[in-house]
Amino acid sequence: RKIPKVGHTFFQKPESCPPVPGGSMKLDIGIINENQRVSMSRNIESRSTSPWNYTVTWDPNRYPSEVVQAQCRNLGCINAQGKEDISMNSVPIQQETLVVRRKHQGCSVSFQLEKVLVTVGCTCVTPVIHHVQ
Amino acid sequence: RKIPKVGHTFFQKPESCPPVPGGSMKLDIGIINENQRVSMSRNIESRSTSPWNYTVTWDPNRYPSEVVQAQCRNLGCINAQGKEDISMNSVPIQQETLVVRRKHQGCSVSFQLEKVLVTVGCTCVTPVIHHVQ
């Protein structure tokens, strides 16, 4: 799903207040709900009728440093017999997410939000167009 | 997929530098790759064999203010005949994501990262255990 543009309001102070100095804001240390965890079933990526693999990208100047991307294994979907059914489509499910980019020059460290497109998994769908061969 | 705990390194300055004052950091205004967009197939939530609905939660003190959650419509999956097959499972695909929480007292505005669990869509899986009914 899409993250809307920031516009010019969310990160600004109210109009009656002095502007933010130097184009930066105060980011408090610590993460709210840091211990919240995904509780998905085991191995759904291989048990799915639209199975997928995971690739991990690593960047020490990004939080989280590890971003996991899914890739659908098949064009079609896997049927009850374990065979690929090409009358159906394996389709990626994508999500826009925020990460934090760390920028440092010597002892001057600042952070910036970055939007990242993550493929979270795949789902099996009916094709829209059944065209004449 | 899981966001690891922040620990005490990512948001800290190097040890040789003076510590961050008041437990806060500098967050630069603007978002890198802000114009990046999801390009998913049309209506996959209703075309999927594990279809889902969307619910929007809204919070003006969160960025993004709108967070969309998916809920699987079925317990089982939809077969080629459009009937539900309860020998299969519709399973949510979840993703941990970051949002920014705005906190203000008068003209003093600060921000904090918050971890949110988002259900992005659903996929159809084979149960591991086929138990006697």
Epitope: S39 | R73, N74, L75, S90, L117, T119, I129, H131
Partner: nanobody, 125 residues
Framework: EVQLVESGGRLVQAGGSLRLSCAAS????????MGWFRQAPGKEREFVAA????????AYTDFVRGRFTISRDDARNTVYLHMTSLKPEDTAVYYC??????????????????WGQGTQVTVSS
């Protein structure tokens, strides 16, 4: 973590009706399919009914189908079990549960991680 609290159980005459409620607090209620299970004295806990995350789909065990109805109200973070035409063999402690895993089909008890403390339903003849 999700906390579940059942209510609505009581003594009722055979043929009567009851509505059990299960109030959820904690993590997002809509993230979970929900189920009702029951346990009669000296018997194992057994599946009664389940409802999907969206509330669009329900499933029942054979011995309650047509008599019991499961529903959910996401605005109130509550799941209900409406029980009609009650029989003495429906006497049990009824438990509400949230499904967090998908290793079995919807009636597989081990897939339900969060449980309430139960509410007693007694049907007298």
């Amino acid at each position: 973590e999700v906390q579940l609290v059942e209510s609505g159980g009581r003594l009722v005459q055979a043929g009567g009706s009851l509505r059990l409620s299960c109030a959820a607090s904690g993590r997002t209620f809509t993230s979970y399919p929900m189920g009702w299970f029951r346990q009669a004295p000296g018997k194992e806990r057994e599946f009664v009914a389940a409802i999907s995350m969206s509330g669009d789909d329900t499933a029942y065990t054979d011995f309650v189908r047509g008599r019991f109805t499961i529903s959910r109200d996401d605005a109130r973070n509550t799941v209900y079990l409406h029980m009609t035409s009650l029989k003495p063999e429906d006497t049990a402690v009824y438990y509400c549960a949230a499904r967090t895993s998908y290793d079995g089909t919807y009636d597989y008890i081990d897939d339900y991680s969060y449980w309430g403390q139960g509410t007693q339903v007694t049907v007298s003849s």
